[in-house]
Interface confidence: medium
């Protein structure tokens, strides 16, 4: 977990339930200090593109990888459950070379039948020389990437290329895009669900179907819950992210699969190659597209995007810019809420949700996306709270 965006000073960590600050040494120490006990259930995270399992050490006030010694699938399931994933999502665990780690969390197998974190102790050695890697859900895998692909300046997507992409309909009309992260949860943009569209009964999600004409009554999934980021600002579009929980879980198949949420420790590079997809207009002020389109874009560093000739300090840490400063390729009306993804280690990661921009595909007006890295903590919290 990244303890970011907290109102507590660097030395304190905020309780979600009360907003009070507690000392980092009280976090994950086996005793509940927050009224909701969340200081004891945010003690595990997956780190980096290899999904290395890390546990927070209250003694050292830092995160450490878990040594493979005596580890088994049951502990893996428990760790995933604590992050907010359901048991039946669990994909696999692997082992990764400890790659120079000098500090580990190890299992004390004689600790008896206690909570997993009470079995873990701090160690400077790991005899297996391997750390635990966890896949809580089989995510980020597609059939084939798109051809160089009309968002504006894109081309139609191939079946299975963007299996996490959903079309979110209100009264049989495509309104926004979204991204599947589990069979039950969709990530979209908060501006898509501003009142009165914050009522879940307005929304139906269509997955695995690339043509709007083929999204017929009966093929959609009703939305049960809409959760908008509490700090979303409709004027500035800061914290422009929302979650939708479906009434019935999606059935994953070749054309319906989740994208991976980014893990802490994943560094995004300026000019990194990414893809956007959606049924948005293929020209500014145009109509929604009949077919799913996708396009390559490059990440644009925030400093550059905030320069006077681009967005002049409108870009916050909760936003990412992507596109081309010369224009020509961009997301547009109707793409909102949809994915900005990048591939690393042959896995597709959701790094942005389509948020805003000045016009479509204009020079010096790239697309702006919610920075999903900043929101993963919040996303997992909602998933966990929902049980």
């Amino acid at each position: 977990w990244k303890f970011m965006g907290s109102k507590c000073s660097n030395s304190g960590i905020e309780c979600d339930s009360s907003g009070t600050c507690i000392n980092p040494s009280n976090w994950c120490d086996g005793v509940s200090h927050c009224p909701g006990g969340e200081d004891e259930n945010r003690c595990v995270r997956l780190y980096g593109p290899n999904f290395i399992l890390q546990v927070y050490s209250s003694q050292r006030k830092s995160w450490h990888p878990v040594c493979q010694d005596d580890w088994n699938e049951n502990y893996g399931r428990a760790a995933c459950r604590d992050m907010g994933y359901k048991n039946n999502f669990y994909s696999s665990q692997g082992i990764v070379d400890d790659s120079g780690s000098t500090s580990f969390m190890k299992l004390n197998t004689s600790a008896g039948n206690v909570d997993i974190y009470k079995k873990l102790y701090h160690s400077d050695a790991c005899s297996s020389k391997a750390v635990v890697s966890l896949r809580c859900i089989a995510c980020g895998v597609n059939l084939n990437s798109s051809r160089q692909s009309r968002i504006v300046g894109g081309e139609s997507a191939l079946p299975g290329a963007w299996p996490w992409q959903v079309s979110l309909h209100v009264q049989n009309v495509h309104v926004c895009g979204g991204s599947i992260i589990t069979p039950e949860w969709i990530v979209t943009a908060a501006h898509c669900v501003e009142k009165p569209l914050n009522n879940p009964w307005h929304w139906t999600a269509f997955a695995g179907i690339l043509r709007q004409s083929f999204m017929f009554y009966g093929a959609g999934y009703q939305v049960e819950k809409v959760i908008s980021h509490p700090n979303y600002d409709s004027k500035t579009k800061n914290n422009d992210i929302a979650l939708m929980k479906l009434q019935k879980p999606l059935t994953f198949n070749d054309l319906v699969k989740p994208v991976c949420l980014p893990n802490p420790g994943m560094m995004l590079q300026p000019e990194q190659l990414c893809w956007i997809s959606g049924w948005g207009a293929t020209e500014e002020k145009g109509k929604t597209s009949e077919v799913l389109n996708a396009a390559k874009v490059l990440l644009i560093e925030t400093q550059r995007c905030n320069s006077r000739y681009v967005y002049d300090n409108l870009i916050t840490p909760a936003m990412i810019c992507a596109g081309f400063l010369q224009g020509n390729v961009d997301s547009c009306q109707g793409d909102s809420g949809g994915p900005l993804v990048t591939s690393k280690n042959n896995i597709w990661w959701l790094i942005g949700d389509t948020s805003w921009g000045s016009g479509c595909a204009k020079a010096y007006r790239p697309g702006v996306y919610g920075n999903v890295m900043v929101f993963t903590d919040w996303i997992y919290r909602q998933m966990r709270a929902d049980g």
Epitope: R150, P159, G208, L210, R211, N253, L255, V256, T282
Partner: antibody, heavy 121, light 111 residues
């Protein structure tokens, strides 16, 4: 090569049911839809519906709802169509045909051999 | 449902000449840069065979004498020069929306 092999001709009595099969080979069964098309003697083509083996989801032409039921068996890469309460109007050649799904350009690039169904007492 | 009207119902063409078959849709089948109209050839006792997809794209293995054109509601299949093996019934089919429908067919005979 890519093929759709259908079951042989059938002679059935009015009121009976019949299950026609369509075995796919030479491609990944779960990546494409299987469509069913009816052709009455000397007549044109009518689209009955599709099934997507990746998820089992189906779509029926309103005209054939209650008449045709589409299913699949992934393990044998076979699609089935059950025709129920047969009448002389159901006497026809039935084709299965492959189409892409999702982007659903919606054309049929591979066709089955056809199954001739005769309904007669 | 979109109704496809083919004309003529039948035509006789001499070897080496041009055959032109028309298909008119009851509403536009073009959107988002695509025209969702396809053409098939069917010979007696055989299944239909895809010739042209998305109005103008030649299916692989189909001779270049077959070509398709059109957008919106009016589409044409051209065969030039006609060869003996082209005697068959030709069908148009749309996939603009559901249900998918076919034209009634045009029977091509050789003079």
């Amino acid at each position: 090569q890519v093929q759709l092999q259908q079951s042989g001709p059938a002679l059935v009595k009015p009121g009976a049911s019949l299950k026609i099969s369509c075995e796919a080979s030479g491609y990944t069964f779960t990546y494409y839809s299987i469509n069913w098309v009816k052709q009455r003697p000397g007549q044109g083509l009518e689209w009955i519906g599709w099934i997507f083996p990746g998820s089992g989801s189906t779509y029926y032409n309103e005209k054939f709802k209650g008449k045709a039921t589409l299913t699949i068996d992934k393990s044998s890469s076979t699609a089935y169509m059950l025709l129920s309460s047969l009448t002389s109007e159901d006497s026809a050649v039935y084709f299965c045909a492959r189409s892409d799904y999702g982007s659903a350009y919606g054309y049929f690039d591979v066709w089955g051999t056809g199954t001739t169904v005769t309904v007669s007492s | 449902d979109i109704v496809l009207t083919q004309s003529p119902a039948s035509l006789a063409v001499s070897l080496g000449q041009r055959a032109t078959i028309s298909c008119r849709a009851s509403k536009s089948v073009s959107t988002s840069g695509y025209s969702y109209m396809h053409w098939y050839q069917q010979k007696p006792g055989q299944p239909p065979k895809l010739l042209i997809y998305l109005a103008s794209n030649l299916e692989s293995g189909v001779p270049a004498r077959f070509s398709g054109s059109g957008s919106g509601t009016d589409f044409t299949l051209n065969i030039h020069p006609v060869e003996e093996e082209d005697a068959a019934t030709y069908y148009c089919q749309h996939s603009r929306d559901l249900p998918l429908t076919f034209g009634a067919g045009t029977k091509l005979e050789l003079k």
